[in-house]
């Protein structure tokens, strides 16, 4: 099972001091954002128990394996379901904590109920504040059952669930009608997928016999040990105040685990820590009781004394859960509760035993999960013990499970079960990723998803030129770092593959799929210089450049011209895709702008040194619009236009351009030049009679300027159809008759 614990601090005098902490003992837990471990998640689950919205809760991460939820402002914030999610991939596990209000109308006698498939579960809600009304039971938020208030037994409302099945699992609640849902008694029912003492897909496998209140997991047969106990069968007690699968975690605060509720992966659920009991886990065990929730009884024999955290403490000469075994009976010594090996390895397993008479090599045997018995190949006999060594045949996945070391002498026998985990070396599912490339190096990210088991201890990157038969080059890197492959050949394809390893002998996995990574071209080294440039218009610039003469072929694919407009902070780039080109026309520039200009040779994606920069000023754009344009009909075919010269001219006007268009017409407009720029009047002739026309005009210096306003005018009536408009200009002070 995943080593994941959700701790709830139940000192409830002040909700602001309440906190929930999720602790993971998994390797690489909670690192997030990398390929080796998703983060721990800790949140309130409002899907079933909804509480009034309040300020958001604060999540604080303490290192990679711990996350804490705080910021509860009022007691109602605490009521409901909280969950912590940890572990990676198929081992991703959710641990659930259900919090009841101490002031509720109904309180659960026991919050977590773990039962076997087919059992009868009984949920008991104790009356705390009586109401003479029905009690509604809900399952996962939906109506389930009604009890009349007369049906209370000894101040309790009982919900009996016969023949429970796994789908019956979930959150149950008991609530008085017309009472706030926050006053409900909330329960968690966990139904194991198998009957008592069984596990596995068809429930065909036998559980190891979990001790001290441990619960056999119905999927993998492992014991989920209560807080404060460890070992394959939960046979060992942790030191006071410690928890976690290896007793590696310590309860916070000076009073140890007092006032803390511990929630572990299903099918365990939640309980107080070892040595504590009560709804708020603040009461020490009564004499003769020990363990989580003080559920266990010592019943020590032969002078043993009861410790509320660990159970019987035996006097010398005795051992066993109740001090019932004499030290003369043979005893397996210091057997690890869990061993890990890699697939297809042939490990050596040691098993040590003591006793009177003294165990010899033939009296110690090793039994595999399939029942195969291995005899030791050699034994080391020391004054206080005999250590038998077993050479294990090549391991297969089916060897995962509970192995047993057994010693038999005339004084009796002892056996110790231990878990063997056969791990599959990791194999990359994808090729490594190219991050950046240069002409002689590649930067590669080796982090890829993989099949098999972690944690990843080393990453090997194998590479060689594509289509080469030479040996692979290998570089060993830290799993979390990117790799730089150096001293490569330019413009060359390399085949690159990842190989992952996990700890232990035979932990190297097969090579992952190859990928082709190509180094960049050589950098161009020649520096061009600008020969010259000239302006071909207000927005056009002709540029020419040269390159130094060097022997050999030119290393380059083309040129990059860069124009920098410092005023606007804008850069214009122009690509000239021929390495033979030595001139370019730049168009669409901004008139009246001061540019800094340079040119660079490029090769593939690499740029060579830039030429010394040149500074170019483009002439400004055309003049402003003519002012006060006016149209006046003179006859059935003539209209006179008058205007005033534009203001603030940047230079002398070379001409005016008039645009003539029939109002509402669909045809193209006609443009007429007025070539005497000093004039402020012109007559447009050859127009159609009784026709409405639109006019506008603009001036030209080096370029055309802005259009004036548009004016409308109609010719006088009933003339003949004209051939088309023409123009005659006069200075405004001249007479108009000819």
């Amino acid at each position: 099972a995943v080593d994941l614990t959700l701790l709830a601090n139940l000192r409830l005098t002040d909700p602001q001091r309440f906190f929930l902490t999720c602790v993971s003992g998994e390797a690489g837990a909670g690192r997030g954002s990398d390929a080796w471990g998703p983060p721990l998640l800790l949140e309130k689950d409002d899907r079933i128990v909804r509480t009034p919205p309040g300020p958001p809760l604060r999540l604080a991460r303490n290192g990679s394996h711990q996350v804490t939820l705080r910021g509860f402002s009022k007691p109602s914030d605490l009521v409901g379901v909280f969950s912590c999610v940890g572990g990676a991939g198929a081992r991703r596990t959710r641990v659930i904590y259900v919090h009841n209000s101490p002031g509720a109308h109904l309180l659960p006698d026991k919050v977590t109920h773990t039962v076997n498939k087919g059992d009868t579960a009984v949920l008991s809600a104790r009356v705390h504040k009586e109401k003479q009304t029905d009690v509604i039971w809900k399952s996962n938020g939906s109506y389930f059952y009604t009890l009349d208030w007369h049906e209370a037994q000894d101040g309790r409302f009982l919900l009996q669930l016969p023949n429970v099945q796994p789908p019956s699992s979930g959150i149950y609640s008991a609530t008085y009608l017309e009472a706030s849902p926050l006053g409900s008694a909330f329960f968690r029912l966990i139904v194991r997928g198998c009957g008592a003492g069984r596990w596995g897909p068809g429930c065909t496998k036998e559980c190891p016999g979990c001790l001290h209140g441990g619960v056999c997991h119905d999927h993998d047969g492992e014991c989920v040990c209560p807080p404060g106990f460890t070992g394959t069968r939960c046979e060992q007690a942790c030191r006071e105040g410690r928890f976690g699968q290896s007793c590696q975690e310590q309860c916070p605060g000076i009073s140890g685990c007092r006032g803390l509720t511990f929630c572990l992966p299903d099918p365990y659920g939640c309980s107080c820590g070892s040595g504590w009991r009560g709804s708020q886990c603040q009461e020490a065990c009564a004499p003769g009781h020990f363990g989580a929730d003080c559920r266990l009884q010592c019943q020590c024999q032969n002078g043993g004394t009861c410790d509320r955290f660990s159970g019987c403490v035996c006097p010398s000469g005795w051992h066993g859960v109740h001090c019932e075994k004499s030290d003369r009976i043979p005893q397996i010594l210091n057997m690890a509760s869990e061993l890990e090996f890699n697939l297809e390895t042939m490990p050596r397993i040691n098993c040590a035993a003591a006793g009177n008479p003294f165990p010899v090599r033939g009296s110690i045997e090793l039994r595999k999960p399939d029942g195969t018995v291995l005899l030791s190949t050699k034994a080391i006999v020391e004054p206080e013990k005999t250590t038998a060594e077993f050479e294990v045949p090549r391991l297969v996945l089916a060897d995962s499970g509970f192995w047993e070391c057994r010693v038999s002498t005339s004084g009796g026998q002892d056996s110790r079960r231990f878990k063997v985990n056969v791990k599959v070396p990791p194999v990359p599912l994808a090729a490594p990723r190219l991050l950046t490339k240069q002409s002689r190096q590649l930067v590669v990210s080796p982090l890829v998803s993989f099949s098999g088991d972690g944690p990843i201890s080393t990453v090997r990157l194998h590479y060689r030129p594509q289509d080469s038969t030479m040996d692979w080059s290998t570089i060993v890197v830290d799993p979390s770092e990117n790799v730089t492959l150096m001293n490569l050949r330019p413009k060359t394809g390399y085949s690159v593959r990842v190989q992952l390893s996990r700890p232990g002998e035979g932990g190297e996995g097969a090579w992952g799929p190859p990928t082709l990574m190509t180094t960049d071209c050589p950098e161009p080294l020649l520096q061009p210089w600008l020969e010259g440039w000239h302006v071909e218009g207000t927005d056009r610039l002709r540029v020419s450049w040269s390159l130094p003469l060097v022997p050999g072929p030119l290393v380059g694919d083309g040129f990059l011209l860069r124009l920098w407009d410092g005023t606007r902070g804008q850069e214009r780039r122009e690509n000239v895709s021929s390495p033979q080109a030595r001139t370019a026309l730049l168009t669409g520039l901004t008139p009246g702008t001061h540019y800094q200009l340079d040119v660079q040779l490029y090769h593939c994606t690499l740029l060579g040194p830039a030429s010394p920069p040149a500074h170019v000023l483009l002439p400004p754009s055309g003049p402003p619009a003519p002012r006060h344009l006016h149209a006046q009909a003179l006859s059935d075919s003539e209209i006179q236009l008058t205007w005033k010269h534009p203001e603030a001219l940047p230079g002398p006007i070379s001409k005016y351009v008039v645009e003539v268009q029939v109002a509402g017409g669909a045809g193209d407009p006609l443009w007429i030049d007025v070539d005497r720029p000093e004039e402020t009047s012109t007559i447009i002739r050859g127009l159609n009679a009784s026709t409405r026309y639109l006019f506008r005009m603009r001036a030209s210096i080096q370029g055309l300027g802005d259009w004036s306003n548009t004016v409308e005018e109609s010719t006088l009536g009933n003339g003949l159809q004209a051939e088309g408009p023409v123009q005659e200009s006069r200075a405004a002070e001249e007479g108009l008759d000819q």
Epitope: R50, T146, D148, E151, T175, E178, S180
Partner: antibody, heavy 126, light 108 residues
Framework: EVQLLESGGGLVQPGGSLRLSCAAS????????MHWVRQAPGKGFEWVSS????????YYADSVKGRFTISRDNSKNTLYLQMNSLRAEDTAVYYC???????????????????WGQGTTVTVSS | DIQMTQSPSSLSASVGDRVTITCRAS??????LNWYQHKPGKAPELLIS???SLQSGVPSRFSGSGSGTDFTLTISSLRPEDFATYYC??????????FGPGTKVDVK
Amino acid sequence: EVQLLESGGGLVQPGGSLRLSCAASGFTFSRYKMHWVRQAPGKGFEWVSSIVPSGGWTYYADSVKGRFTISRDNSKNTLYLQMNSLRAEDTAVYYCARQMYYYDSSGYYVGRFDIWGQGTTVTVSS
Amino acid sequence: DIQMTQSPSSLSASVGDRVTITCRASQSINTYLNWYQHKPGKAPELLISAASSLQSGVPSRFSGSGSGTDFTLTISSLRPEDFATYYCQQSHSISTFTFGPGTKVDVK
């Protein structure tokens, strides 16, 4: 389909007895509080009796107390009303109904009759 | 016991009319009031729970309001299938349930 079907009605003389049945289908009968409601000709509805899911507690209207007995058989998904000492004023169409609870954010509300049967007619006449 | 009264006892209306029925409890029942529709020879149908909560599948032209002792059922635009008798029912007492005498809505 969720359904209630009453049966057992008929013509009976004053002082006589009759047993009504209500067969439930389409839902888990054993989890719900059940009721009998009647409607006399030309009159409104009158609640008659109710029984809790376990069958262990019952309630009656004053007008039928001591004469009528409500019961249920959860294994047969059936509700019963045993009517003794019948009177002319017991003449009515008798309906069985399922009680459900309306829930909103402020808490639970007591019964509404969300499923009704089509009714069975009881006539008490000499 | 809580007594329920309804008014009017009957009303005639046309399709498209807005119809309002009132129900009064002899003592405060909070919002613990349900409305039912009944057509002859059919099972009664629950329309509204808890004074104002429309039952799933009931058309939105039906609405309920009120709290304490005075309650209202409104049909915003009467349809042909709405001609029936309407009953209010208190659910404040958990052991006994009383109905109003009913309001018959028929064609004008």
